[in-house]
């Protein structure tokens, strides 16, 4: 596969990826961080200046939400 | 009008390994993400893993990780599921599928499926 | 992994009968649920998308309803060509998951 991915590619690996569930650009708030100071990664950031497998790419994934309790 | 034209049926040792192929005839192969299905007999649908050719992304269900690999030839439009380290519960049909948008998983156009024998 | 469980796994009814199967997600997977109906020997054909979505070409005594986790689908009057196997699958998040199967068996 090709080394980075970019605008339309880098839109249907997420969906791909995640499903239907959707996907950030940019990790949530503290995703992964613990400064609260530290820079915001993002995906193209990770995935079309540099290159990223898919593991990278499911970090941008949406949360699964809860089921609803009874 | 899309067609996804399996590979024949297989008879496999257990312990040995299976490459069933799946050709795409219709439409435009490289960015639209097929995907695997096994049915055992008399059994539900199991989705093994996906791939979008263009890309060369595939993933993978957990439980077939380091198993199975699926792989494209954009020059025939053809996927691959290759499956190793059979064994008897393995036995089953296998079907490619394949959605309406590069990304779906809304399986408008299966394969004829591949019944793959594992007997020892 | 999200489970998908489908009730009853096994019905009998009649031509002309009205019949509602249901799905239930482990998870949330809001409306991203499909249906898929299976004759012996055949593949699956795409029946219902995105819950209450009808696939182009399918008939429309066939209808979809449900979001969140529970789910069904109704077959309005039931035909002779209906009888199969009916499964449910979320898109919601993979690995893609499928109910066990609703086998629509003749009374």
């Known amino acids: 596969g090709p080394e980075t991915l970019c605008g339309a590619e880098l839109v249907d690996a997420l969906q791909f990826v995640c499903g239907d569930r959707g996907f950030y650009f940019n990790k949530p708030t503290g995703y992964g961080s613990s400064s609260r100071r530290a820079p915001q990664t993002g995906i193209v950031d990770e995935c079309c200046f540099r290159s990223c497998d898919l593991r990278r790419l499911e970090m941008y994934c949406a949360p699964l939400k809860p089921a609803k309790s009874a | 009008q899309v067609q996804l034209q399996q590979s024949g049926a297989e008879v496999k040792k257990p312990g040995s390994s299976v490459k069933v192929s799946c050709k795409a005839s219709g439409g435009t192969f490289s960015s639209y993400a097929i995907s695997w299905v096994r049915q055992a007999p008399g059994q539900g649908l199991e989705w093994m893993g996906g791939?979008?050719?263009?890309?060369?992304?595939?993933n993978y269900a957990q439980k077939f990780q380091g198993r199975v690999t699926i792989t494209a030839d954009e020059s025939t439009s053809t996927a691959y599921m290759e499956l190793s380290s059979l064994r008897s519960e393995d036995t089953a049909v296998y079907y490619c599928?394949?959605?309406?948008?590069?990304?779906?998983?809304?399986?408008?156009?299966w394969g004829q499926g591949t019944l793959v024998t594992v007997s020892s | 992994d999200i489970q998908m469980t489908q009730s009853p796994s096994s019905l009998s009814a009649s031509v002309g009968d009205r019949v509602t199967i249901a799905c239930r997600a482990s998870q949330t997977i809001s409306r991203y649920l499909n249906w898929y109906q299976q004759k012996p020997g055949k593949a699956p054909k795409l029946l219902i998308y995105a819950a209450s979505s009808l696939q182009s070409g399918v008939s429309s005594r066939f209808s979809g309803s449900g979001s969140g986790t529970e789910f069904t689908l109704t077959i309005s009057s039931l035909q002779p060509e209906d009888f199969a196997t009916y499964f449910c699958?979320?898109?919601?998040?993979?690995?893609?998951?499928f109910g066990q199967g609703t086998r629509l068996e003749i009374k």
């Open positions: 599928a394949r959605g309406p948008r590069g990304y779906s998983y809304n399986f408008d156009y």
């Open positions: 699958q979320q898109t919601y998040s993979p690995p893609i998951t």
């Open positions: 791939i979008i050719p263009i890309l060369g992304i595939a």
